[in-house]
């Protein structure tokens, strides 16, 4: 498999058949598949060097692994997008052997002197062809030469098989399955041959190809493949329930932010709630996690403005649940990214010198910002797309707080909507779905560069759109939701999470 280790070294060779028998639309589809693969790999924060070859009668090398920009995923994608099927029109035979020889030449070193560390680089060849080579001879011989060059399969004690993976995608109207199978790697419990039909669900294909065991602690990563559970798709999501004898129970959501902490809303708890009465589950697991302590933001005080006629005041409505035992990260349990951390700098593929202010401008620009939250409906977790009103619609969004029960007598809405809040909901630019009571404490998320970054904590809403456990379809335009802006509680987050190795900027 493709081992995605941010500290490892890898070369990926993309080889695309542009011969007559492929056809223009299949060629375009294959290109799109490779673009998606480059993006998927880049989303892990790994920077392999890419080689890019198209071929028919002759190969054409578009990107050499030795080029300075070969590890710049955006630049390689640009080169790939600029390739046309017509580029091989004049000489449109199929010489797969010559194409693989071009790969061999990129792998080999000058004067046959291996450079220091050559044996630590993993090599991946992704060949997209119909297998109908009609000139140049059998391409399998070049695969053997490559194996020789990389000293694979020679030493029984150290066969080095995981340093070469050859994946073959069958593209085109007619595919010679025998030829394709012969070229691909053969490894136990791994799939190295894919058909056109597979390419309709690329996440499924990538799931078969990628080994992410070295990057399970990466924040904001998800798997969207069809066999995945709700928690593959939102592995940070935590369900919180507070049992109060003789008062029933309160349900909330939260987000895993580190191996020991879940971030949620302070209002989910009262000062009387004991740790043992708080149940937290993650990854869709049945068992509850043991709680060590709940840490409230020191400025949170729901009764803080009672004298001023404000029955409930949600400023600084955030809390961290510290777990007794360390979480074991896996594909269904992993953290979400937090603002102003090194993890988010890497997730957004920003320079290491990026400041907190620059992250803020990237994630919360002064405009409508596409975001999402996760809600549970009929025992299923579903993503709801909303827009954070952070530009010209911000004022009207915040003013609608006056329609919330108990806030109708508030003269100045900034008394309840402080600078700590983000506002979603309403009907412009689109009709936003609203949060329900049980969504409280869950993350408000920005999805960027294939990663998920939490920018807010769901706090309160103007209208209860979920009476009788059913989300109403028709809701008034003033149905707004308010979320604590994580950029506005950073000092607290940084202090409480200072031992969690998140690299707060």
């Amino acid at each position: 498999k493709i081992v995605l280790d941010p500290s490892g070294s890898m070369n990926i060779y993309l080889v695309l058949d542009g011969s007559d028998s492929i056809g223009a639309s299949n060629f375009t589809g294959a290109k799109k598949c490779l673009v998606n693969l480059i993006e998927k790999v880049a989303s892990y924060g790994v920077k392999p060097r890419y080689g890019l070859v198209t071929y028919a009668t002759y190969p054409k090398i578009w990107v050499k692994v030795s080029e300075a920009d070969s590890s710049n995923a955006d630049w390689v994608t640009k080169q790939l997008n600029e390739i046309n099927y017509e580029d091989h029109k004049l000489k449109s035979g199929t010489n797969t052997k010559k194409a693989l020889q071009a790969v061999y030449s990129m792998m080999s070193w000058p004067d046959d002197v291996p450079p220091e560390g050559w044996n630590r680089t993993r090599h991946v060849i992704i060949l997209m062809t119909d297998g109908l080579h009609n000139m140049g001879g059998d391409p399998i011989t070049v695969i053997d030469e490559i194996r020789d060059l990389l000293y694979i399969g020679k030493d029984r004690k150290n066969p080095r098989e995981d340093y070469l993976d050859v994946y073959v995608f069958g593209v085109g109207p007619l595919v010679n399955q025998v030829n394709i199978n012969a070229l691909a790697s053969k490894k136990d419990n791994e799939q190295h041959v894919f058909k056109v039909k597979d390419m309709e669900n690329l996440e499924d294909v990538f799931y078969q190809m990628i080994d992410e065991s070295q990057s399970l602690s990466l924040c904001g990563m998800v798997w969207e493949h069809r066999k995945g559970t709700d928690y593959h798709k939102q592995p940070w999501q935590a369900k919180i329930s507070v049992i109060r004898p003789s008062k029933g129970h309160e349900s909330c959501m939260g987000a895993v932010v580190s191996e020991y902490f879940v971030l949620t809303a302070a209002h989910c708890f009262t000062v009387d709630d004991k740790e043992h009465s708080i149940k937290v589950s993650v990854g869709g697991e049945k068992r509850d996690l043991e709680i060590e302590v709940v840490l409230f933001h020191p400025n949170y005080n729901i009764n803080g403005k009672k004298e001023a006629g404000i029955p409930e005041f949600y400023d600084y409505d955030v809390a961290l649940i510290k777990l007794k035992n360390k979480l074991k990260y896996g594909q269904t349990i992993r953290p979400i990214c937090l603002p102003c951390t090194e993890g988010t700098t890497r997730a957004l593929r920003l320079p290491p010198t990026t400041t907190c202010q620059q992250q803020k401008e990237e994630l919360l620009p002064a405009q409508d910002i596409k975001a999402l939250f996760v809600s549970e409906e009929e025992k299923k977790l579903t993503r709801k797309e909303v827009y954070i009103k952070n530009g010209d619609k911000k004022g009207s969004c915040e003013r609608d707080a006056q329609y919330a029960p108990g806030y109708d007598k508030v003269k100045d809405i900034s008394e309840v909507v402080t600078p700590r809040f983000l506002c979603t909901g309403g009907v412009s630019p689109y009709a936003d779905p609203n949060t329900c009571r049980g969504d409280s404490g869950g993350p408000l998320i920005v999805h960027k560069r294939s990663r998920f970054i939490q920018v807010g904590v769901i706090s309160w809403g103007v209208v209860d759109v979920c009476k009788n456990q059913k989300r109403q379809k028709q809701v008034p335009a003033h149905a707004r939701d308010f979320h604590i802006n994580l950029f506005q509680v950073l000092p607290w987050l940084k202090e409480k999470l200072q031992d969690e190795d998140l690299g707060f900027l």
Partner: antibody
Framework: QVTLKESGPGILQPSQTLSLTCSFS??????????VGWIRQPSGKGLEWLAS???????YYNSDLKRRPTISRDTSNSQVFLKISSVDTADTATYFC?????????????WGQGTSLTVSS | GDRVTISCSAS??????LNWYQQKPDGTVKLLIY???SLHSGVPSRFSGSGSGTDYSLTISNLEPEDVATYYC?????????FGGGTKLEIK
Amino acid sequence: QVTLKESGPGILQPSQTLSLTCSFSGFSLSTFGLGVGWIRQPSGKGLEWLASIWWNDDKYYNSDLKRRPTISRDTSNSQVFLKISSVDTADTATYFCVQIPYGSRNGFDYWGQGTSLTVSS
Amino acid sequence: GDRVTISCSASQGINNYLNWYQQKPDGTVKLLIYYTSSLHSGVPSRFSGSGSGTDYSLTISNLEPEDVATYYCQQHSKLPWTFGGGTKLEIK
């Protein structure tokens, strides 16, 4: 440009309450990412961070101190205050007010010239 | 004209979150270096910082008479923020 100026009583008797004011200009304490802190230096000794207050009204204190001070602010008048109740001779020091940009990669960018406090009976 | 290096050792790793300050004899304090090696604006380039993990240093190349001062390191990694005891620099 950024300036900070501390003011205080100069002399106090033991058990009295110390009230210090930092008046600043050139920035606003409601600007994202900015904070103001207090640092003290007993005569001939090193520097000790006491407390900080951030743009969002978060307050942080040095947990190693015997008696916790109280920090507060008046954003509209560009002032930050520090109170230490029941002072003793160990609180004799020069008290500095500093501007702090948020973030681990930052230092105390700008310092006031300090105000001297003597605690004596 | 000399070159001087002042060392600062932390009791645990501080991820390069280390700053250097200069306190002149009249008591005024200035930030010189932040985040181990970044020069604060307006500070002469003869000041430089380096280090990692627990060991850090401030180097002044080409000493000038106005460099007579006490130099403090300060960790910005974890609360409470703490300062080193200070190193007094005198010129012979």
